[in-house]
Interface confidence: low
């Protein structure tokens, strides 16, 4: 807390300008009117204040707005945003996407800090859902943002927002998250033709069920191995050798390199060896010829 001291004669600030960088902390406290600061916040960012001086300016705003800053001030906080605590931010009511963008810009290139996480949380809760424009903005600044949400939070993403999602935004999503996102993507892209649809849906296929993979195998999509390896094991297991061959197209030879890894490893164990041999890849570990193949799905459902 800065002591209350009288402003020296002639030092009362009439404007927020560069002359203030020469003020000591106590002079800033005594000579800068909080209301003036609030109306000229846009100037603060252009002035090279020290961290200590920014602390004083924050203190003045906190005194002026004990219940939380108005959006007109928040939008122009600039580097002063980095001084805010999550507790400060929880008092705010941020409704403008422009305000959100301005504050995210300040933190650009850094990890998502607790302050930013709180800001985003407040903004999204205020809007009621993750609309397309918000998602577009958040993933532009934080490509991993979508995958940092719980499956429950993702369920509030409307299908229309899926158009804003880029493949790299899904890099760190786990299967449970893709389980939620995939049906939304399927709905969002349902009116596209075959090849265009596959390009868009590809990144979400880690959440696709068996029947959708079977349908894709009939459409000459030529899925690459990187995508195939991200598919749900339980969705891949029921696929026949012929279906996998159609699904992968020319990429089918890549199965050999992946034969020790899930889901390929587990899929091989469920196939007849003579069916695997038709691929000509030397895949081993299938069910020997002449053995009875039980339908394990019912057994698994009962266990």
């Amino acid at each position: 807390e800065v002591e209350k001291t009288a402003c020296p004669s002639g030092k009362k600030a009439r404007e927020i300008d560069e002359s203030l960088i020469f003020y000591k902390k106590w002079e800033l406290e005594a000579c800068v009117d909080a209301a003036l600061l609030a109306t000229q916040m846009d100037r603060v960012n252009a002035i090279p204040f020290t961290y200590e001086q920014l602390d004083v300016l924050k203190h003045k705003l906190d005194e002026l707005y004990p219940q939380g800053y108005p959006e007109s001030v928040i939008q122009h906080l600039g580097y002063l945003f980095l001084k805010m605590s999550p507790e400060d931010i929880r008092k705010w009511n941020v409704t403008s996407l422009e305000t959100l963008k301005a504050l995210l810009e300040v933190n650009k290139g850094h990890e998502m800090s607790p302050q930013v996480a709180t800001l985003i949380d407040r903004f999204v809760k205020g809007r009621g859902q993750l609309d397309k424009d918000t998602l577009d903005t958040l993933t532009a600044f934080y490509p991993g943002y979508l995958c940092s949400l719980s499956p429950e939070e993702l369920s509030s993403v409307p299908p229309s927002s899926i158009w804003a999602v880029r493949p790299q935004d899904l890099d760190t999503c786990d299967p449970r998250q893709l389980d939620v996102l995939y049906p939304k993507a399927r709905l969002a892209f349902q009116n596209m033709n075959g090849s265009e649809y596959f390009v868009k849906i590809q990144s979400f296929l880690g959440g696709a069920p068996t029947e959708d993979l079977k349908a894709l195998s009939q459409q000459n999509v030529s899925m690459d191995l990187a995508t195939f390896m991200k598919l749900r094991t339980d969705a891949v297991l029921p696929l026949t050798v012929a279906e996998v061959q159609k699904l992968l197209g020319p990429h089918v030879e890549g199965l050999k390199a992946e034969e020790r890894h899930r889901p390929v490893r587990d899929w091989i164990l469920r196939q007849r060896q003579d069916d695997l041999d038709t691929l000509g890849l030397g895949l081993q570990g299938g069910i020997p010829n002449g053995y009875l193949v039980l339908d394990l799905s019912m057994q698994e459902a009962l266990s």
Epitope: E111, M112, D171, T172, D174, K230
Partner: antibody, heavy 114, light 108 residues
């Protein structure tokens, strides 16, 4: 400040076990995927394993699959690597990595030798 | 599995030199490549991610470029603090992450 501190390394006989720990501070541990990377002294970096934010998804390098187990305790801000059936070629400095690969620990040395 | 090959293995240079290190991927990884710097006895430090994005706090003399299978790390004017080992790392073919074998930048 943002920090990862590994512990639990040491000398162990082939076939033995060790449990490495990595204590995180200064960032929201529960928001990030975490990794273990190892390095034989004088050699290159080798990725070992990763775990997602809530611990439900884990992945391993072929060389350690079935022997090593990665886990995390978000309440304690700690990452673990349980290493069983250790072999001579597991001897290395083990690094804990997080924060989208921007945050690395100082490393802990594991020596497997009879 | 995807292979990452760095060249040269060792590079002798002087302070002020422009230095370029190359990293080749055995298959396309789009722009999913990172560069790290490691000094003796220390942990690696992230310099560049997404092929060309400079990590916060890293001097602007470091830059990255490339896409697909060919990538380069450039140090525009080598400083005394830059003598170290540099590694590339792919994260375009998850779930596996692969590092290059490293390039040692030493004093000429």
């Amino acid at each position: 400040q943002v920090q990862l501190v590994e512990s639990g390394g040491g000398l162990v006989q082939p076939g033995g076990s060790l449990r490495l720990s990595c204590a995180a501070s200064g960032f929201t541990f529960s928001s990030y995927w975490m990794h273990w990377v190892r390095q034989v002294p004088g050699k290159g970096l080798v990725w070992v394993s990763r775990i997602n934010t809530d611990g439900s998804t884990t992945t391993y390098a072929d060389s350690v699959e079935g022997r090593f187990t990665i886990s995390r305790d978000n309440a304690k801000n700690t990452l673990y690597l349980q290493m069983n059936s250790l072999r001579d070629d597991d001897t290395a400095v083990y690094y804990c990595v997080g924060g989208h690969w921007a945050v690395w620990g100082q490393g802990t040395t594991v020596t497997v030798s009879s | 599995d995807i292979q990452m090959t760095q060249s040269p293995s060792t590079l002798s240079a002087s302070v002020g030199d422009r230095v370029t290190i190359t990293c080749r991927a055995s298959q396309s990884i789009s722009d999913r490549l990172a560069w790290y710097q490691q000094k003796p006895g220390k942990a690696p430090k992230l310099l560049i991610y997404k092929a060309s994005s400079l990590e916060s706090g890293v001097p602007s003399r470091f830059s990255g470029s490339g896409s697909g299978t060919e990538f380069t790390l450039t140090i525009s004017s080598l400083q005394p603090d830059d003598f170290a080992v540099y590694y590339c790392q792919q994260y375009g073919h998850l779930p596996m992450y692969t590092f290059g074998q490293g390039t040692k930048v030493e004093i000429k």
